[in-house]
Interface confidence: medium
């Protein structure tokens, strides 16, 4: 079966977010994420809820595995439609390592810079999606503190798929991904049983992101 899928589970009707936020989505693109189209379907369902534009919400996407790639910057696209088209084209870059701290740190230091479209005085939001314990977890505490110091609100999503498929304990992994999320953890941390289930959290995640500007 395909490494690429289009998840077509139906979700609740779109609720648009017309607030000012700078959102950077940090995607784990390592080999164990499968099927990748579950990730692009999740992006599609989340992004279509947003009112994207230079004076509204801006979205940038960073993908990491062994290395980090800026898929597109915050100021690259000026409408929801453009961002949706770009997000659909994001390919899985692979990698046998999951450098989560590197991904988050790169998002903080580079994606949230004015050169890449970040706006002064606009709330910064980071959404981290990953399916495995990081290979650089010794750096994670410092990286999260740096985000905290810069008032970056963090939502973290743990995909348990590769653990469930391998009958591995998820406890350590879940604790790590919880540590990435902003306080209160129960409002900023999500876990899904596998990649296909990502679309099921879109509505709640969207509502919690939009509530930041309430």
């Amino acid at each position: 079966v395909s490494p690429t899928f289009q998840v077509v589970n139906s979700i609740a009707p779109v609720q648009e977010c017309s607030t000012q936020l700078d959102i950077v989505i940090v995607l784990d693109g390592s080999n164990s994420i499968y099927p990748w189209d579950s990730v692009t379907a999740f992006l599609n369902d989340l992004l279509e809820r947003m009112d994207i534009g230079p004076k509204q919400t801006q979205v940038g996407i960073v993908q990491y595995g062994e290395n980090v790639t800026h898929e597109f910057n915050l100021n690259k696209y000026s409408s929801t439609e453009e961002v949706l088209v770009a997000a659909k084209k994001i390919v899985q870059r692979g990698g046998r390592q999951t450098m989560t701290a590197l991904g988050i740190d790169t998002a903080r230091k580079e994606a949230f810079t004015e050169a890449r479209g970040a706006r002064r005085g606009v709330k910064k939001v980071m959404v981290i999606v990953t399916d495995g314990e990081s290979h650089d977890n010794h750096r994670l505490k410092k990286v999260i503190q740096d985000c905290e110091d810069e008032n970056i609100q963090r939502f973290s999503i743990a995909i348990l798929g590769s653990y469930n498929r391998g009958n591995l304990s998820t406890e350590k992994f879940v604790e790590e991904i919880k540590s990435i999320a902003s306080e209160p953890t129960e409002k900023h941390f999500f876990n899904v049983s596998d990649e296909l289930a990502l679309v099921t959290i879109v509505k709640t995640l969207g509502e919690r992101i939009f509530a930041l500007e309430a």
Partner: antibody, heavy 124, light 112 residues
């Protein structure tokens, strides 16, 4: 050894529903995705959808969206495929097939194990 | 959807002689991870499909080495070096690179 055993042949009337089962053995049920593929008489193979036995999440081919439901029972290592609003064109052999997987941080390789097939005949 | 086209539809062969089946895709099957997810299946009369070759050229366990797969991009070939009686059946290619997975129409191998 790894085996997928499907339920027996079914004869249904147009408009009815059919539920086909596929019992897995010889491997860790929750470690592999399961697919359903059908083959109408004299036709090629057609992929219908996939289910994750660990979480129960599904993805269906657009053609079957709204008519197909895939479920699983982890206690019996069984997956089910229910097709509703049957029409004569749904007359086919329905197969469950496992997605091959090379291990954690690995890759996925086609459909490596198949059930014996279940013949569904839709006729008034 | 990616269209997979097989030829010939039917391949009558003499026992002990070679056979070759072609499979073409409407777009490249190279995935972003560098792998090409093109697989070959054999379906003997009255039996379920059985995977012979995965990712273009890798044998499944128990598959005789008279079967071989080759190709790249959009053009792929399954070869049987010397056809035996047990090779009679339908051979299908399947792509798993693009959504949704699609199969070729099948090639029937029969003995002359």
């Amino acid at each position: 050894q790894v085996q997928l055993v499907q339920s027996g042949a079914e004869v249904k009337k147009p408009g009815a529903s059919v539920k086909v089962s596929c019992k897995a053995s010889g491997y860790t049920f929750t470690s592999y995705y399961m697919n359903w593929v059908r083959q109408a008489p004299g036709q090629g193979l057609e992929w219908m959808g996939i289910i994750s036995p660990s979480g129960g999440s599904t993805t269906y081919a657009q053609k079957f969206q709204g008519r197909v439901t895939m479920t699983r029972d982890t206690s019996t290592s069984t997956v089910y495929m229910e097709l509703s609003s049957l029409r004569s064109e749904d007359t086919a052999v329905y197969y469950c097939a496992r997605t091959g997987y090379s291990g954690y941080e690995g890759y996925y390789y086609g459909l490596d194990v198949w059930g014996q097939g279940t013949t569904v005949t839709v006729s008034s | 959807d990616v269209v997979m086209t097989q030829s010939p539809l039917s391949q009558p062969v003499t026992l002990g002689q070679p056979a070759s089946i072609s499979c073409r895709s409407s777009q490249s099957l190279v995935y972003s991870d560098g792998n090409t997810y093109l697989h070959w299946f054999q379906q003997r009369p009255g039996q379920s499909p059985r995977r012979l070759i995965y990712k273009v050229s890798n044998w499944d366990s128990g598959v005789p080495d008279r079967f071989s797969g080759s190709g790249s991009g959009t053009d792929f070939t399954l070869k049987i070096s010397r056809v035996e009686a047990e090779d009679v059946g339908v051979y299908d290619c399947m792509q798993g690179t693009h959504w949704p997975s699609t199969f070729g129409g099948g090639t029937k191998v029969e003995i002359k």
